[in-house]
């Protein structure tokens, strides 16, 4: 009569997280007397998973009725599998002993691999807004997946990006893994409606990748262009001057009119018009009473956009000339740039 053998027919078992794992084990003999125990891992640090003799193992159920005298099937089911359950499981026959049972024979082991889905990718952009032509970084993170193999891609408006770096942690064996990727994106003036997408593909997703998105509207700042023009005379002694504020984003904008350097009026952009590219236009006008001025008047449209340093554009209104004879787009003062910061 040959000796008892502990047979674990499955070298490996693959289970999706949340499912039930069946670990098979049979003994070839009813003797020796003594219980079966299941362990995860081998050696002194092994973890007891199930003891036929005693203990409470709420996640474990036996496939057969172990109380039956002739039972030789010691297979178990472990419910609600998580990545932390991954490892090699051993079915071990013990010999009844006093004070403790004595380990007699072990099965060859069954490696339990857990397939766990990655979490939804979270894409985050820079803390501060940036202007077109600048390069900004976006990060994408996904956690809790297993096995380690995973593919991550970046897209901007459907076009795949190539300038990114990706890390999967940890490098060694683990119950589950995390991915972290940083992509560099060059902003353009047309990016208000743009989206950056991080796409993660994993064996558990059955060809349906997970996506995380970031709207560039939360990242970009498009500074306005200013144009100050003099409109035809509304009355004999009045001139209407407009300040066209074009192509700005976001909407937060404050405009101040200055006459010869003195604040005339301040207003906040409200009834703006939106362009197709998502930027905004706004117009403000100032009615200037020419008869109130003896000398030429320097009108300045000063705009503070989204908390940034103010930009301005000036227009010289010549009092000596008849208003009707003023050009509709008088050149700004001769001192230089039409658009400059005011401090």
């Amino acid at each position: 009569e040959e000796e008892l053998q502990v047979i674990q027919p499955d070298k490996s078992v693959l289970v999706a997280a949340g499912e039930t794992a069946t670990l098979r084990c049979t003994a070839t003999s009813l003797i020796p007397v003594g219980p079966i125990q299941w362990f995860r891992g081998a050696g002194p640090g092994r973890e007891l998973i199930y003891n036929q003799k005693e203990g409470h193992f709420p996640r474990v159920t036996t496939v057969s009725d172990l109380t039956k005298r002739n039972n030789m099937d010691f297979s178990i089911r472990i419910g609600n599998i998580t990545p932390a359950d991954a490892g090699t499981y051993y079915c071990v026959k013990f010999r009844k002993g006093s004070p403790d049972d004595v380990e007699f024979k072990s099965g060859a082991g069954t490696e339990l691999s857990v397939r766990a889905k990655p979490s939804a990718p979270v894409v985050s952009g820079p803390a501060a807004r940036a202007t077109p032509q600048h390069t900004v970084s976006f990060t994408c993170e996904s956690h809790g997946f297993s096995p380690r193999d995973i593919t991550l891609k970046w897209f901007k408006n459907g076009n795949e990006l190539s300038d990114f770096q990706t890390n999967v942690d940890p490098v060694g064996e683990s119950v589950s893994y995390s991915i972290h990727s940083t992509a560099k994106v060059v902003l353009t003036r047309e990016d208000v409606h743009s989206q950056v997408i991080c796409e993660v593909a994993h064996v558990t997703l059955q060809g349906d990748p997970l996506r995380g998105t970031a709207n560039l509207s939360e990242t970009i700042r498009v500074p306005p262009t200013l144009e100050v023009t003099q409109q035809p005379v509304r009355a004999e002694n009045q001139v209407n001057v407009t300040c066209q504020v074009r192509k700005f984003y976001p909407q937060r904008l404050q405009l101040t009119w200055l006459e010869n350097g003195n604040v005339s009026r301040t207003e906040t952009a409200s009834t703006v018009t939106e362009n197709k590219d998502g930027t905004y236009n706004w117009m403000s006008w100032l009615l200037v009473n020419v008869s109130a001025h003896r000398d030429d008047v320097k009108l300045t449209c000063q705009v503070e956009h989204d908390g940034q340093p103010a930009v301005s554009k000036s227009h010289d209104l010549k009092v000596s000339a008849h208003p009707k004879e003023q050009g509709s787009n008088t050149a700004a003062e001769n001192t230089g740039s039409n658009e400059r910061n005011i401090y």
Epitope: E3, L4, G97, S98, V102, K105, S106
Partner: antibody, heavy 118, light 107 residues
Framework: EVQLVESGGGLVQPGGSLRLSCAAS????????MSWVRQAPGKGLEVVAT????????YEPGNMKGRFTISRDNAKNSLYLQMNSLRAEDTAVYYC???????????WGQGTLVTVSS | DIQMTQSPSSLSASVGDRVTITCKAS??????LTWFQQKPGKAPKTLIY???RLVDGVPSRFSGSGSGTDYTLTISSLQPEDFATYYC?????????FGQGTKLEIK
């Protein structure tokens, strides 16, 4: 026919070491657990050490632990007992026994005498 | 450890006699008991296992009985070759323990 032949016994001084061997034949040695059992002169029998068929698990009763080590070489059909720190009370006939399933001993060798004396 | 008390320690009998040797365990050993025979300078020989099952090749005059803590070896008609020392062994649990032996001598 099952045959178990012990060797390696002899006279050894207290504190000394000895290695006993058991040559097995007539059965598939690698399929069976084995044990060493001893019998002191005029005394009863006691199990010294037990090993399973592949050598992965061994058992030594509490009073033997640490001093006696059982091992096997299935390729050579041989069982061994390494005895260290020997004492006068270890003087006995040492038997090699086939021990299927760590149950009862179904076949025994003739024994080898170990005498521990100065 | 389980104590095995064997009695008698020695016994004189004649060829043809019916002989009974008993073994008492300090606790229930669930019939996990074996009997074996030893002659001077010879290897012990297993006669009975699981309290009452005869090993192949062992003469039918040998029989075993008992359960719980009390077990008996009976030789129904002693033969000259039966004069030897007999031991019981419990293998219900580790460590396995032996009775101290019964020496069967010719009267």
């Amino acid at each position: 026919e099952v045959q178990l032949v012990e060797s390696g016994g002899g006279l050894v001084q207290p504190g000394g070491s000895l290695r006993l061997s058991c040559a097995a034949s007539g059965f598939t040695f690698s399929s069976f657990s084995m044990s060493w059992v001893r019998q002191a002169p005029g005394k009863g029998l006691e199990v010294v050490a037990t090993i399973n068929s592949d050598g992965s698990n061994t058992y030594e009763p509490g009073n033997m632990k640490g001093r006696f080590t059982i091992s096997r070489d299935n390729a050579k059909n041989s069982l061994y007992l390494q005895m260290n720190s020997l004492r006068a009370e270890d003087t006995a006939v040492y038997y090699c026994a086939r021990d299927p399933n760590w149950d009862y001993f179904d076949f025994w060798g003739q024994g080898t005498l170990v005498t521990v004396s100065s | 450890d389980i104590q095995m008390t064997q009695s008698p320690s020695s016994l004189s009998a004649s060829v043809g006699d019916r002989v009974t040797i008993t073994c008492k365990a300090s606790q229930d050993i669930n019939s996990y008991l074996t009997w074996f025979q030893q002659k001077p300078g010879k290897a012990p020989k297993t006669l009975i296992y699981r309290a009452n099952r005869l090993v192949d090749g062992v003469p039918s005059r040998f029989s075993g009985s008992g359960s719980g803590t009390d077990y008996t070896l009976t030789i129904s008609s002693l033969q000259p070759e039966d004069f030897a020392t007999y031991y019981c062994l419990q293998y219900d649990e580790f460590p396995r323990t032996f009775g101290q032996g019964t020496k069967l001598e010719i009267k």
